[in-house]
């Protein structure tokens, strides 16, 4: 039951995270005008990955897309790429994880296949989350660098008479959405990987005896898997419900094996 819950929760957390990454990528507020020096500006500027916007105090908002590709800073292109890769990996991960969910039956899919799919989607979510966090962090670093550069040149005098106030930009809402979303996707991916360990059946059929270095006693397994030859009717390692009692050693050795019917 715990593995199903972990898998399901991992899926939901990742789903929310990827939705957040998509939202952050589409948002216009990656950087917003710093109002520290001019809190009463009548014109408010903010920028996204795809366009820059200006909002006047009347409420009128005008946005202009970055229609050039070659003219854009390499860092912005890199952030775009990271976010898109994150979305694509996340979307594929979601698709894979839907089929990997324990609660969904698809034909006669084996537990080993579901375990592999769960692991695959988990890794995809982890990479997706890392891409988003990296993208947002690169953009944030770019902002911090530009902020201090523009602070150094805050006022450029024109003939000693006229002041030109340079517009400085600070962190926008999209950065925080991106960080949180990337973190959630990462956590969801880790949860999927943990769930995979619980889903995976044992690698060999021969699980009848457990040895103890300290003593000569042998604990015999009351049932479960067909022992000895391994060529019985249960050659595919399918779990046979064994209503029998387990020894303390078994519970410690194989905590996940008896979780499911």
């Amino acid at each position: 039951m715990a593995v199903t819950a972990c898998q399901g929760l991992g899926f939901v957390v990742s789903l929310i995270g990827i939705a957040g990454i998509i939202a952050a990528t589409c948002m216009d507020q990656w950087s917003t005008q710093d109002l520290y020096n001019n809190p009463v500006t009548a014109v408010f500027n903010y920028q996204g990955l795809w366009r820059s916007c200006v909002r006047e105090s009347s409420g009128f908002t005008e946005c202009r897309g970055y229609f050039t590709l070659l003219g854009l800073p390499a860092m912005l292109q890199a952030v775009r790429a990271l976010m898109i890769v994150g979305i694509v990996l996340g979307a594929i991960g979601l698709l894979v994880s839907i089929f990997a969910l324990k609660c969904i039956r698809i034909g006669s899919m084996e537990d080993s296949a579901k375990a592999n799919m769960t692991l695959t989607s988990g890794i995809m979510f982890i990479v997706s989350g890392l891409c988003a966090i990296a993208g947002v962090s690169v953009f944030a670093n770019m902002l911090v660098t530009n902020f201090w550069m523009s602070t150094a040149n805050m006022y450029t005098g024109m003939g000693g008479m006229v002041q030109t106030v340079q517009t400085r930009y600070t962190f926008g809402a999209a950065l925080f959405v991106g960080w949180v979303a990337g973190g959630l996707t990462l956590i969801g991916g880790v949860m999927m990987c943990i769930a995979c360990r619980g889903l995976a059946p044992e690698e060999t059929n021969y699980k009848a005896v457990s040895y103890h270095a300290s003593g000569h006693s042998v604990a015999y397994k009351p049932g479960g898997f067909k022992a000895s030859t391994g060529f019985g009717s249960n050659t595919k390692n399918k779990k046979i419900y064994d209503g029998g009692a387990r020894t303390e050693d078994e519970v410690q050795s194989y905590p996940s094996k008896h979780d499911y019917v």
Epitope: A42, V43, Q47, S52, E56, S57, S58, G59
Partner: antibody, heavy 119, light 113 residues
């Protein structure tokens, strides 16, 4: 047709108070920001205050900060300017003006109401 | 606060001639975000409220004759009346529309020579 009609002006003693009103018609009042601009006799224009369509934020010129308050009643299509601690230099024709949707300009103006501060 | 300085204080131009009014701001009115200059021009005839002529430094308000044009960027701006008509006699004001408090220039009185 857009119309702005100011009222409430008159003679007041220094230190006194006055409340100006501006009745708006011919447009959706609640969607536009509104300004108060004044003009002393024989002088130029001086911007006084601005209130956004959503009643916040509001802005004032430094000379009236703390003495004047701007407000609006969207249900009544009305703009108000409460003037306290009036001084002789506040004597002027007070215009209410509608903020145009773009360009931060004032596209429609009332005819103005005269406020005289004198003892 | 942004200080707006207009020149000349008064101007006399013959009918049909070109009239030019200048306006300078103490800070740039150019917004980098949209490359627009937040400067507005108004016309005020005697006994009347001001009338909006030009916003964003060069965009004519609807209904304003095309003989009125605005130009300039940053801190220096110009209002030009290409062919002066008798009804253009008025006081012209430039206004900072970039940051609060909004400030007006002192005005330029335009007369017929």
């Amino acid at each position: 047709e857009v119309q702005l009609v100011e009222s409430g002006g008159g003679l007041v003693q220094p230190g006194g108070s006055l409340r100006l009103s501006c009745a708006a018609s011919g447009f959706t009042f609640s969607t536009f920001g509104m300004h108060w601009v004044r003009q002393a006799p024989g002088k130029g224009l001086e911007w006084v205050s601005y209130i956004t369509s959503g009643e916040s934020p509001i802005y004032f010129t430094d000379t009236v900060k703390g003495r004047f308050t701007i407000s609006r009643d969207n249900a009544k299509n009305s703009l108000y300017l409460q003037m306290n601690s009036l001084r002789a230099e506040d004597t002027a024709v007070y215009y209410c003006a509608r903020s145009s949707y773009y360009g931060q300009s004032m596209d429609y103006w009332g005819q103005g109401t005269l406020v005289t501060v004198s003892s | 606060d942004i200080v707006m300085t207009q020149s000349p204080d008064s101007l006399a131009v013959s009918l049909g001639e070109r009239a030019t009014i200048n306006c300078r701001s103490s800070q740039s009115l150019l917004n980098a975000g949209n490359r627009k200059n937040y400067l507005t021009w108004y016309q005020q005839k005697p006994g009347q409220p001001p009338k909006l002529l030009i916003y964003w430094a060069s965009t004519r308000e609807s209904g304003v004759p095309d003989r009125f044009s605005g130009s300039g960027s940053g801190t220096d701006f110009t209002l030009t009346i290409s062919s002066l008509q008798a009804e253009d006699v008025a006081v012209y004001y430039c206004q900072n529309a970039y940051s609060y408090p909004f400030t007006f220039g002192g005005g330029t009185k335009l007369e017929i020579k």
